[in-house]
């Protein structure tokens, strides 16, 4: 009875359990009744991380260095080339497809580190009674304006993003 | 396409002031935070000053404060440096840098060398 499913490192291809192909090396052809999965390596630069039956090798990442990349870990044809940014610059994502000199804090956040070449800007949330309205690599949370120190009411409460908004007293008649 | 021009550098002496020019061109100049960034002969970067897009608002790194004012003009759609009591340590180039501060937006920058 021909199998319905393989072991580890297996896949199941016209009823019959053949072998992946190893990391760093792609499919040729199936294997038969007769003869093994035919794999063949990756070439220059190309690579496979997994345990597969993939006909084409992934290529590697290419450092863009007019985007501020450089290679930090040459690739294999088992891993990928791992980049990063010049000296100074940060990654925009966990990927490192691109740099930024520092990233800027959003609406709601406000600066609580600066950037330096070794890290980058440090955000933190703006507190009750502190906003931050603006997108910022400098700017940290603002207090919410004092209505009553100029003998005002707040008409409009503040949020992390916006102040409050002040207004005139009921005069009583 | 964005473009930031950096001018105004040049040789002085010790004690001596520059002003440095960034004209910015491709972006709405007036809606963005802008940064002047420094690179010291076979040195990091150093931030070494901010300021929000109306111009109320500035950041000066310690290295700088007291000697340097950063400013804007966005009719001109340009931002400048004016730097004052110049020291041997201030030498550097100098560029400008606009949010998102990506690596293509970087410009060749000015050269500044305060040398007696």
């Known amino acids: 009875e021909p199998p319905t499913a393989c072991r580890e490192k297996q896949y199941l291809i016209n009823s019959q359990c053949c072998s992946l192909c190893q990391p760093g090396q792609k499919l040729v052809s199936d294997c038969t009744e007769f003869t093994e999965t035919e794999c063949l390596p990756c070439g220059e630069s190309e690579f496979l991380d997994t345990w597969n039956r993939e006909t084409h090798c992934h290529q590697h990442k290419y450092c863009d260095p007019n985007l501020g990349l450089r290679v930090q870990q040459k690739g294999t044809s088992e891993t990928d080339t791992i980049c990063t940014c010049e000296e100074g610059w940060h990654c925009t994502s966990e990927a490192c497809e691109s740099c930024v000199l520092h990233r800027s804090c959003s609406p709601g956040f406000g600066v609580k580190q600066i950037a330096t070449g070794v890290s980058d800007t440090i955000c933190e949330p703006c507190p009750v009674g502190f906003f931050s309205n603006v997108s910022s690599a400098f700017e940290k949370c603002h207090p919410w304006t004092s209505c009553e120190t100029k003998d005002l009411v707040v008409q409009q409460a503040g949020t992390n993003k916006t102040d409050v908004v002040c207004g005139p007293q009921d005069r009583l008649r | 396409e964005v473009q930031l021009l950096e001018s105004g550098g040049g040789l002085v002496q010790p004690g001596g002031s520059l002003r440095l020019s960034c004209a910015a061109s491709g972006f709405t100049f007036r809606d963005y935070e802008m940064w002047w960034v420094r690179q010291a002969p076979g040195k990091g970067l150093e931030r070494v000053s901010?300021?929000?897009?109306?111009?109320?608002?500035?950041y000066y790194a310690d290295s700088v404060m007291g000697r340097f004012t950063i400013s804007r003009d966005n009719s001109k759609n340009t931002l400048y440096l004016q730097m004052n009591s110049l020291r041997a340590e201030d030498t550097a180039v100098y560029h400008c840098?606009?949010?998102?501060?990506?690596?293509?937006?970087w410009g060749q920058g000015t050269l500044v060398t305060v040398s007696s």
């Open positions: 901010a300021i929000n897009p109306q111009g109320t608002r500035t």
């Open positions: 840098a606009k949010e998102p501060y990506s690596y293509d937006y």
